[in-house]
Interface confidence: low
């Protein structure tokens, strides 16, 4: 018995120990999100196993204080959703000490009224404005600088309709260095990490973008004031072209975003002359005026492999030969305006004959194949070199209709160390949630308990392998305090354990003959530190009351050996 | 702004080849096909063919295909096409322009005069 | 290969007078046509795509139409630049084809 597999919050992540009872789940959020809930649930035992608390969500929050901002973004409230009316949201993002900041417009989509986006100069809603949406027809692409060390970011919508707000990215970046680039859809490569004069950066997309403006190539320039020689450039969802790749997607123009209505596109696909192409529309949310066209050849003339309209699901089609012609035509009259409305085509160069396609390599990694025919169960496993993970699934099979089973996975740079654990009697502050190169741990001992080994440890990036941490998590031994001096026993009392010195932590117990009442605490304990000491003072018996003095006296008399006896021990 | 230069007139003999410029700019060079055109005095257009210069892929029309050879440079953002064997009937204007919906930019045409 | 048939092959009309070329195509090319000027000096420039789109910068006097496979360029008011030559092209089908041209002269 287990419990269920936690839902993962949108814009967030959860990574599970176990679903067993015991097993936990720790939930956090994309950048730019917070978490609202627990950040940690725990499956309990029962009949039928359940987790401690509800699952978390992450929201975007209309304003906050970043402060020690490095790398990270802020969005409006239900980005990429719409956000809502009457909202004042302020951000203020500080940069560590002696760092600017670099901003970056991913989005701006704000409704045509009177919603406005103001960016300024500075730490408070009177430092000067260097954006303002109603001043500014085109975002600036190459972005925002600080000349200090803040930027203060104001959103206001009024009453009337709403739009998917924004999203900004910001950096932070030294005194004589470049702002860490940004290419949305795509991905860059640096000559070093931390960008200064002298740095190059090489940019990509990511499959079925294009690049576009700005340059493939850019580098840090000018010593006295660092700055890109060209602007970033951009990758988008182009409508039509043509392609010649052995595998690639197709993409709806301007995907994510929503296409454009009258729209005319026509994309032709390309592989060797006796090969063949498998189309896999992975998405398929198009209006129901608008037309997706596959053609079996290399024109609008060739024959028709399928014709779609309206939203499908996930299906896979089979030309016949080396080309086919994809064409999309969206309604010139309406438009279908949602976030993720559109098409996502992936193809693949298959062979005609009686075998799977031929799997490439992958950078960082290596494959083996079970058999070196591709044919039908043919199994290949891709493995990843040391310090690069398999991403996506490592093993792929030869299916019945000659696709894989799989996509091809990749292999990533390991750019985090593990978890380095709780470490008993201790308690940890932690400067990054998932130990990104650079984060640290630090353990901090509970009182009475000494920290044997390095208090903090640093993730350390490596040339070969993975990142590992400075060193080994510490202990927390037990500390080698001096002993509490044993108290007398109160009169007309009697204490234990009768020892003349007490160990730190150790505990004594009182207790009182007949007819006296114990007057203070009845257990004390001896406290670690230095010197150790009682927590409280010795407690007195106090006779309860005349008569009961008296009638405790005659009982006293009574059983005489038995009681002197006792009240011998006590003194 | 979109600009394609060609290169300039060329005067050649029968048998000989001839190798034609077209140098864009204003755009990202293999972010579109190059089409080429040819224009004999006095008549229409005709359609060469097309090459994609991000994958050097070409296309060309059956009529063409051992003529024309299509070629790019990405580095100096230049389409280039070279016609071989020469005969009288391929002294022409020859155009470039720029797709993917062909034609939106032209250049402005290469004269290729082609005389003993 | 799609034959794309132009008339008239030449046409004289003066200023301010309304014309329309045509172009009809032997197989179906659904609205793939581009009209292009050619102007005496041998400069091309495109006027309308996908058979009516106008591109940016083309006065808003000339328009594109089409009628099943017959496909019309109209100039409601001629000015004195748009004397020159006109083809339409087909893009639906490889290898393109251009229709034989219009000769637009000044009467």
């Known amino acids: 018995l287990s419990c269920h597999f936690p839902r993962r919050p949108a814009y967030g992540d959860v990574t599970v120990t176990s679903l067993h009872p015991g097993g936990s789940a720790r939930f956090h959020c994309a950048t730019g999100y917070q978490l609202k809930g627990a950040r940690h649930l725990t499956c309990l035992n029962a009949t039928q196993p359940f987790w401690d608390s509800k699952e978390p969500v992450c929201i975007a929050a209309c304003g906050g204080v970043i402060r020690n901002a490095t790398t990270g973004r802020i969005v409006s409230p239900g980005f990429p959703g719409n956000y809502s009316n009457n909202l004042t949201c302020h951000w203020l993002l500080e940069a560590p000490e002696g760092q600017r900041l670099h901003l970056h417009f991913e989005k701006v989509s704000l409704a045509e009224d009177d919603d406005r986006l103001i960016i300024r100069n500075g730490d408070n809603v009177e430092a000067p404005p260097v954006y303002d949406s109603y001043e500014v027809e085109y975002l600036p692409i190459e972005g925002l600088l600080s000349s200090g060390k803040h930027f203060f970011v104001e959103l206001s919508t009024d009453s009337s309709g709403a739009a998917a707000g924004m999203a900004l990215r910001y950096e932070a970046f030294q005194q004589g260095h470049c702002y860490e680039p940004f290419v949305k859809y795509g991905n860059f490569s640096s000559s070093t990490p931390t960008y200064p004069v002298g740095t190059t950066v090489e940019f990509s997309c990511d499959p079925g973008y294009t690049l576009e403006q700005g340059s493939i190539i850019i580098e840090c320039v000018d010593p006295h004031d660092p700055q890109w020689n060209e602007t970033e450039p951009a990758c988008r969802a182009v409508c039509s072209g043509e392609i010649t790749d052995s595998a690639g997607v197709v993409l709806s123009p301007n995907w994510p975003e929503p296409y454009g209505r009258g729209q005319d596109c026509i994309w032709g696909v390309h592989v060797e002359e006796d090969k063949r192409i498998m189309l896999d529309i992975r998405v398929l949310r198009i209006g129901p005026g608008d037309v997706l066209t596959f053609y079996d050849g290399d024109d609008l003339t060739a024959r028709v492999l399928g014709q779609y309209s309206g939203p499908r699901s996930h299906f896979k089609l089979f030309t016949s030969m080396a080309d086919v012609t994809i064409q999309f035509q969206s309604d010139p009259g309406t438009s279908v305006l949602g976030y993720q409305q559109g098409f996502v085509i992936h193809f693949f160069e298959v062979p005609r004959n009686d075998t799977c396609p031929e799997l490439p390599e992958i950078p960082n990694g290596w494959k083996s194949p079970s058999q070196p025919e591709l044919v039908h169960g043919t199994v290949v496993t891709y493995q990843c070199y040391p310090g690069y993970q398999v991403v996506g699934s490592s093993v792929l099979m030869c299916q019945w209709d000659l696709t894989w089973s799989e996509d091809l996975p990749s292999c990533q740079r390991v750019t985090s160390c593990h978890d380095p654990g709780d470490v008993e009697h201790s308690r940890r502050l932690i400067s990054s949630p998932k130990f990104p190169v650079g984060a640290t741990v630090q353990y901090i001992c509970d009182q009475g308990f000494v920290l044997m080994g390095s208090s903090i440890l640093t993730c350390h990036d490596r040339q070969a392998g993975s990142p590992k941490w400075s060193d080994r998590a510490p202990k927390c031994l037990l500390e080698q305090l001096k002993p509490c001096h044993g108290l007398s026993a109160p009169e007309n009392g009697a204490r234990s354990p009768e020892k003349q010195l007490h160990p730190a932590g150790a505990t004594i117990h009182f207790s009182c003959a007949p007819g006296y009442v114990l007057k203070g605490q009845a257990s004390i304990k001896c406290v670690p530190g230095h010197p150790s000491h009682w927590s409280d003072p010795p407690p007195i018996c106090r006779a309860a009351s005349l008569d009961g003095f008296y009638n405790s006296r005659s009982l006293d008399v009574a059983k005489a050996p038995a009681a002197s006896s006792t009240l011998d021990a006590a003194h | 702004q979109v600009q394609l230069q060609q290169s300039g007139a060329e005067l050649a003999r029968p048998g000989a080849s001839v190798k034609m410029s077209c140098k864009a700019s204003g755009y990202t060079f293999t972010s579109y096909t190059m089409h080429w055109v040819k224009q004999r005095p006095g008549q229409g257009l005709e359609w060469i063919g097309y090459?994609?210069?991000?994958?050097?892929?070409?296309k060309y029309n059956q009529k063409f295909k051992g003529k024309a050879t299509m070629t790019a440079d990405k580095s100096s953002s230049t389409a280039y096409m070279q016609l071989s064997s020469l005969t009288s009937e391929d002294s022409a204007v020859y155009y470039c322009?720029?797709?993917?919906?062909?034609?939106?930019?032209w250049g402005q045409g290469t004269l290729v005069t082609v005389s003993a | 290969d799609i034959q794309m048939t132009q008339s008239p092959s030449s046409l004289s009309a003066s200023l301010g007078e309304r014309v329309s070329l045509t172009c009809r195509a032997s197989?179906?090319?659904?609205?793939?046509l581009i009209w292009l000027q050619q102007k005496p000096d041998g400069t091309i420039k495109r006027l309308i795509y996908?058979?009516?789109t106008l591109d940016s910068g083309v006065p808003k006097r000339v328009s594109g139409s089409r009628s099943g496979s017959d496909y019309s360029l109209t100039i409601s008011s001629l000015e004195s630049e748009d004397f020159a030559d006109y083809y339409c092209?087909?893009?639906?089908?490889?290898?393109?084809?251009f229709g034989g041209g219009t000769k637009l002269e000044l009467k």
């Open positions: 996908a058979a009516s």
């Open positions: 092209l087909q893009y639906a089908s490889y290898p393109l084809t």
């Open positions: 197989q179906e090319i659904s609205g793939y």
């Open positions: 090459i994609n210069p991000s994958s050097d892929y070409t």
């Open positions: 322009g720029r797709g993917l919906v062909p034609f939106a930019y």
